[in-house]
């Protein structure tokens, strides 16, 4: 039998053992987080699968992910949301130490999908392990991009109190309108629930003593936020290594000076 023709996309294919990985992560997460013990992981996988299986992978909508979003509903306490842009590793290192703060990847749905790729094919029940659409070269409405847009929007919409965002001060655009934070999250913070957005600009160079809070892109972020009546604060984190160390050991004498 001749193999059926398969669409060639520019991006890498579905992560190997994708169904098993999602299911295993779900089981692990619900075991560790008592408030999510009621979640049926088989139903979660079915909803996840239903969002993209048998669908043309360049025509995925946020609506496709709604059953999954409903099953993964979770709330973050006020003042405990940490957004990040182009500095995922440090943000995750931070919440691993500061256990009462949460990034999207510390929530069930973000945890399930973190670093994974997936897509299906139109009119078949198969998962495409060969290639998936690339956001730039193929299409933006692909399963992975739409997933992150959907859950990021929801994460921002449900945030309350003072919301923190970690930004990469080593990049030419510290605040980038094309990032998920710049294109989705910042516009979905709710002024009636969010009093302030506090940006932490993470410096890269050891000798970098510039005030990156004065960067034009940060001023741009403040301008956007201000029109929505959300207060804006910005802090330079000159020494990210020391910053993490001081989160771990706040009573350390060296932590009384600036970081």
């Amino acid at each position: 039998v001749l193999p059926r023709w398969r669409q060639q996309w520019s991006g890498s294919g579905t992560t190997s053992r994708f169904p098993e990985t999602v299911l295993a992560r779900c089981v692990k997460y619900t075991e560790v987080h008592p408030e999510m013990r009621h979640v049926d992981c088989q139903s979660v996988w079915d909803a996840f699968k239903g969002a993209f299986i048998s669908k043309y992978p360049c025509n995925i909508t946020e609506e496709d992910y709604q059953p999954l979003v409903k099953l993964g509903t979770q709330t973050v306490p006020c003042n405990k949301t940490l957004l990040w842009s182009r500095i995922k590793d440090l943000a995750h290192q931070f919440t691993q130490v500061q256990r009462d703060m949460f990034t999207l990847e510390d929530m069930l749905l973000g945890y399930l999908a973190d670093d994974l790729t997936w897509c299906g094919e139109f009119n078949t029940f198969e998962i495409n392990y060969q290639s998936c659409p690339d956001w730039r070269k193929d299409c933006s409405n692909n399963p992975v991009s739409v997933f992150w847009k959907t859950v990021s929007r929801r994460f921002a919409e449900t945030a309350c109190g003072v919301v923190h965002v970690m930004l990469n001060g080593s990049r030419s655009k510290i605040f980038d309108k094309n990032s998920t934070f710049g294109s989705v999250e910042v516009h979905n913070l709710q002024p009636e629930k969010v009093q302030a957005l506090e940006a932490w600009v993470i410096h890269g160079g050891r000798e970098d003593s510039r005030d990156l809070c004065q960067d034009p892109t940060i001023k741009e972020l403040e301008s956007i936020i201000s029109k929505r009546n959300i207060r804006f604060f910005c802090k330079n984190i000159y020494r990210p290594d020391k910053f993490l160390q001081c989160v771990k050991n706040p009573e350390d004498s060296s932590c009384l000076s600036g970081i």
């Epitope: 309108k177 709710q190 002024p191 892109t217 741009e220 301008s223 956007i224 201000s226 029109k227 804006f232």
Partner: antibody, heavy 118, light 109 residues
């Protein structure tokens, strides 16, 4: 003295083009989002367009979308409005105004008059 | 047809208190920055109130307030030099635009 000075207005035929300029002085232009607002004779204020500090975010009123282009040259402290395919209903005094975070449009120019008529 | 609704005119005698209303929606007035501008005859608009606060130089006779999807401008101790057009404005999230009211012409009798 904090000032915005518009120029480039004039009489133009329908379908024609004009380029308005607005030169800023007395404040740090690169710290402000900038706007164009117009006022037709005997009518109220109508926001036309805005451009963010770095030019990354640009917004237009539906009435001018696809015809007008806002831009800025931070090295020259200047804001521009390129107006193409002008219509009679674009006849107005055009003001440039900065946007100060948490305040509003707190500095306005004196305005430049654009008349579209055959 | 303006996105924000204002009465076209208002009037009062010197010393009186006058209030001008501005009605909008949750995508503009309710959650976002609200401004009031004063435009004296033949001049450019001037920022009068931002977020219920006055820029320096604006007399304390002028005050702003907001409740839900409506905002209002109050002028107490009305003076003849207050005769002008007054506009409310707000950022609109759903339109990604600044929206203005149609303006209220204040006459001091």
């Amino acid at each position: 003295e904090v000032q915005l000075l518009e120029s480039g207005g004039g009489l133009v035929q329908p379908g024609g083009s004009l380029r308005l300029s607005c030169v800023a002085s007395g404040f740090t232009f690169t710290n402000y989002e900038m706007n164009w607002v117009r006022q037709a004779p005997g009518k109220g204020l109508e926001w036309v367009s805005s451009i963010s500090i770095t030019g990354n975010y640009i917004y237009y009123a539906d009435s001018v979308k696809g015809r007008f282009t806002i831009s800025r040259d931070n090295s020259k402290n200047t804001l521009y409005l390129q107006m193409n395919d002008l219509r009679a209903e674009d006849t107005a005094v055009y003001y440039c105004a900065n946007y100060k975070s948490y305040h509003g449009m707190d500095v306005w120019g004196q305005g430049t008059t654009v008349t579209v008529s055959s | 047809q303006s996105v924000l609704t204002q009465p076209p005119s208002a009037s009062g005698t010197p010393g009186q208190r006058v209030t001008i209303s501005c009605s909008g929606s949750s995508s503009n007035i309710k959650n976002n920055l609200v401004n009031w501008y004063q435009q004296l005859p033949g001049t450019a608009p001037k920022l009068l109130i931002y977020n219920n606060q006055r820029p320096s130089g604006v007399p304390d006779r002028f005050s702003g307030s907001k409740s839900g999807t409506s905002a209002s401008l109050a002028i107490s101790g009305l003076q003849s030099e207050d005769e002008a057009d007054y506009y409310c404005a707000a950022w609109d999230d759903s339109l990604n635009a600044w929206v203005f009211g149609g303006g209220t012409k204040l006459t001091v009798l």
